[in-house]
């Protein structure tokens, strides 16, 4: 695929796929698979629709658009680096060898850990944890109050440890983006 779609670890990824139903409600089966489109069907199917509804899906994979209008774009929830790769959207138009198939490349980037240039004495124990999420529109930032409190000792050493890849991985795995200041 010569175009690519991008998301950060912990975000939702969006892979567009559209077709035009012959008439409203006259739907065509569609399958989504991980890996390039094979000759028939989809390999490693993650979601499938039939003439009426979504009839198979796996966790984290769903259709966010109006699939009854032909918007069969795939949303992958809370992505990890392992979600990178080629995905196949196959529109299974009736007839022999009539399917329309599209390969879309998904690139997952590590979540950014972004310390602001704030002096250490300005840190407070009440510092919020932020999770950046993305839907179809602009990114929005939410404060997650449910994460465990980070104590003063952790805060005081955080700036020095941010370059430590193990900490960065821990932060990524938690889905949190720490903003200091």
């Amino acid at each position: 695929s010569e175009v690519e779609y991008r998301a950060e670890v912990g975000q939702n990824a969006y892979l567009p796929c559209f077709y035009t139903p012959a008439a409203p409600g006259n739907l065509v089966p569609v399958c989504w698979g991980k890996g390039a489109c094979p000759v028939f069907e989809c390999g490693n199917v993650v979601l499938r629709t039939d003439e009426r509804d979504v009839n198979y899906w796996t966790s984290r994979y769903w259709l966010n658009g109006d699939f009854r209008k032909g918007d069969v774009s795939l949303t992958i929830e809370n992505v990890t680096l392992a979600d990178s790769g080629i995905y196949c959207c196959r529109i299974q138009i009736p007839g022999i060898m009539n399917d329309e198939k599209f390969n879309l490349k998904l690139v997952i980037k590590p979540a950014k850990v972004t310390p602001a240039p704030t002096r250490q004495r300005d840190f407070t124990a009440a510092f919020p944890r932020m999770l950046t999420t993305r839907g179809h529109g602009p990114a929005e930032t939410q404060t997650l109050g449910s994460l465990p409190d980070i104590n003063l000792t952790q805060i005081s050493t955080l700036a020095n440890e941010l370059r430590d890849s193990r900490l960065a991985n821990d932060l990524r795995d938690s889905g949190a983006t720490i903003r200091i200041g």
């Epitope: 559209f18 009539n98 329309e100």
Partner: antibody
């Protein structure tokens, strides 16, 4: 690299038909839509129709049903658009463009069609 | 049919300026919007797909944003070679439709 090479300019009489060609190279012809787009002199772009050469599925803009007919020949990796019952309103540049589910990434150079008595 | 409206037919700008072109869809089209540049006598060229993704080889001064019905195309620092007509297009549903075009003129 991906290329779409269109047939040359045509001067035709009103009431006649014409068949424009668009030869593809540099990619798998059967895996992408070929779209046709009309542009009258000094005007904007108007989508005519598309064909998916892998299965020969076609969709037409209602404004061009009965005017345009799309075909594709896998052996020669060429898409065609026939325009029938030509009038002065059909005088325009016609582009073919390769597309998928994410817009028209590659365009032919265009074919100028002039309909004149 | 989905109507794509570009509010300005012409925009005049100077080299180095930031310019934004807007496009409004008559109904929601998710992010299925592309932006094209057409230089005089040339074929259109894809700049932005899926509302905000820059196509391969397109300079990073070109950006796109929006979803639903309102879309914006921005050139952060206009260059002389950017003199062209810019079109938005929706490919959410057939018939695919283009905006009327915005001609960028350099002062």
């Amino acid at each position: 690299q991906v290329q779409l090479k269109q047939s040359g300019a045509e001067l035709v009489r009103p009431g006649t038909s014409i068949k424009l060609s668009c030869k593809a190279s540099g990619y798998t012809f059967t895996d992408f839509y070929i779209n046709w787009v009309k542009q009258r002199p000094g005007q904007g772009l108007e989508w005519i129709a598309r064909i998916y050469p892998g299965g020969a599925n076609t969709y037409y803009n209602d404004n061009f049903k009965g005017k345009a007919t799309l075909t594709a020949e896998k052996s020669s990796i060429t898409a065609y658009m026939q325009l029938s019952s030509l009038t002065s309103e059909d005088s325009a540049v016609y582009f073919c463009a390769r597309g998928a589910n994410w817009a028209f990434a590659s365009w032919g150079q265009g074919t100028l069609v002039t309909v004149s008595a | 049919d989905i109507v794509m409206t570009q509010s300005h037919k012409f925009m005049s700008t100077s080299v180095g300026d930031r310019v934004s072109i807007t496009c409004k869809a008559s109904q929601g089209v998710s992010t299925a919007v592309a932006w094209y540049q057409q230089e005089p006598g040339q074929s259109p060229k894809l700049l932005i797909y899926s509302a905000s993704y820059r196509y391969t080889g397109v300079p990073d001064r070109f950006t796109g944003s929006g979803s639903g019905t309102d879309f914006t195309f921005t050139i952060s620092s206009v260059q002389a070679e950017d003199l062209a007509v810019y079109y938005c297009q929706q490919y959410y549903n057939t018939p695919y439709t283009f905006g009327g075009g915005t001609k960028l003129e350099i002062k």
